[in-house]
Amino acid sequence: FYDIETLKVIDEEWQRTQCSPRETCVEVASELGKSTNTFFKPPCVNVFRCGGCCNEESLICMNTSTSYISKQLFEISVPLTSVPELVPVKVANHTGCKCLPTAPRHPYS
Amino acid sequence: FYDIETLKVIDEEWQRTQCSPRETCVEVASELGKSTNTFFKPPCVNVFRCGGCCNEESLICMNTSTSYISKQLFEISVPLTSVPELVPVKVANHTGCKCLPTAPRHPYS
């Protein structure tokens, strides 16, 4: 009924859009909840985060397992009291993802 | 002052976080602004969209050039009146990106 080659292409596309860990760019200061007086150089790092599509609209692509990876960055605090310091910054790296239903919010929360 | 190897690693990390076209997953129906009774299988496709970091917080990673790529998808209308149709769907694909400042909104717009 449908051309087998086209179906194969569509299926491959679908596999690639599935919920999975994807390399993404995160802003370190906001990730760590740092004040505006602390910033990092570079301000962003590459880590894996869950992303992609689920086959039901009511499901959300969420992480099921996480590792923490250390990135060497310059931490700059303002007012500058010393030379920018090279610090290891631990950032969450999603290693497993799954399409999960959203938990209903508690009616009294 | 700082270990040259560490600086090289940091610089490479920074290059990889820069604003550039990145493969991302977009939901076709919302992309095309389709009504809720039209949906696609697969619901998502992979295209390139601008993403990443800028070296000033006030700049935004925006597309400077776009191509439109055609993806073959099944379009399903509810209620189902016929067999799902294989249709070519044109989706925006960012081919160039730049960190750009925002312009003020026209006071009368």
């Epitope: - | 820069q18 070296n55 003020p104």
Partner: antibody, heavy 117, light 112 residues
Framework: EVQLQQSGPELVKPGASVKMSCKAS????????MHWVKQSHGRSLEWIGY????????YYNQKFRDKATLTVDKSSSTAYMQLNSLTSEDSALYYC??????????WGQGTSVTVSS | DIVMTQTPLSLPVSLGDQASISCRSS???????????LHWYLQKPGQSPKLLIY???NRFSGVPDRFSGSGSGTDFTLKISRVEAEDLGVYFC?????????FGGGTKLEIN
């Protein structure tokens, strides 16, 4: 320590061009945008535009689009601004300024340009 | 372009007094990312401007705590709690939210 060392004063004739430099030290030159600002009459400050030394991308204030050209030489960590078709209106002090992540934070000492016949 | 209006133009003070400078923008300075890029600079006689306060209320490196910034939207204030001789000069507010970046006309802080 972050330092921006600008070239010396310029006395030029109307219609001529001038190219001033701004040598950066004490930080990673390609990691920060370099902005340029014009100060006339000792008070008024006007933003000219900026350049990203990493890739050479520029963004100009519409007003200075036909007046200024911003370039960089990564190998010497130096930013340049060329001003063309000079008139008396262009007589001013010109600053290069490093843009930190949140604001323009370090200013050069300025290059004075005087246009006179 | 966003117009930045500073008042007063000139501010005569006695050493030890409090000083307050106002800056008003012709449009809101809230960026689409939620931040407000309103900064204050001080230009001492014969020197280039120096950053004092960034993003409304954050003191830059080496800036004494007698300097404080406040405000939101379109109205901002720089306060100096106890003026010292080294604080004299011209104060500029500047917006970094939109292009072109624009500056206030300056407020000259001088001794009474």
């Amino acid at each position: 320590e972050v330092q921006l060392q600008q070239s010396g004063p310029e006395l030029v004739k109307p219609g001529a061009s001038v190219k001033m430099s701004c040598k950066a030290s004490g930080y990673s030159f390609t990691g920060y945008n370099m902005h340029w600002v014009k100060q006339s009459h000792g008070r008024s400050l006007e933003w000219i535009g900026y350049i990203d030394p990493y890739n050479g991308d520029t963004y100009y204030n519409q007003k200075f689009r036909d007046k200024a050209t911003l370039t960089v030489d990564k190998s010497s960590s130096t930013a340049y601004m060329q001003l063309n078709s000079l008139t008396s209106e262009d007589s001013a002090l010109y600053y290069c300024i490093r843009a930190g992540y949140y604001a323009m934070d370090y200013w050069g000492q300025g290059t004075s340009v005087t246009v006179s016949s | 372009d966003i117009v930045m209006t500073q008042t007063p133009l000139s501010l005569p003070v006695s050493l030890g007094d409090q000083a307050s400078i106002s800056c008003r923008s012709s449009q809101s300075l809230v960026h689409i990312n939620g931040n407000t890029y309103l900064h204050w600079y001080l230009q001492k006689p014969g020197q280039s401007p120096k950053l004092l306060i960034y993003k409304v209320s954050n003191r830059f490196s080496g800036v004494p705590d007698r300097f404080s910034g406040s405000g939101s939207g379109t109205d901002f204030t720089l306060k100096i709690s106890r003026v010292e001789a080294e604080d004299l000069g011209v104060y500029f507010c500047s917006q970094g939210t939109h292009v072109p970046r624009t500056f206030g006309g300056g407020t000259k802080l001088e001794i009474n």
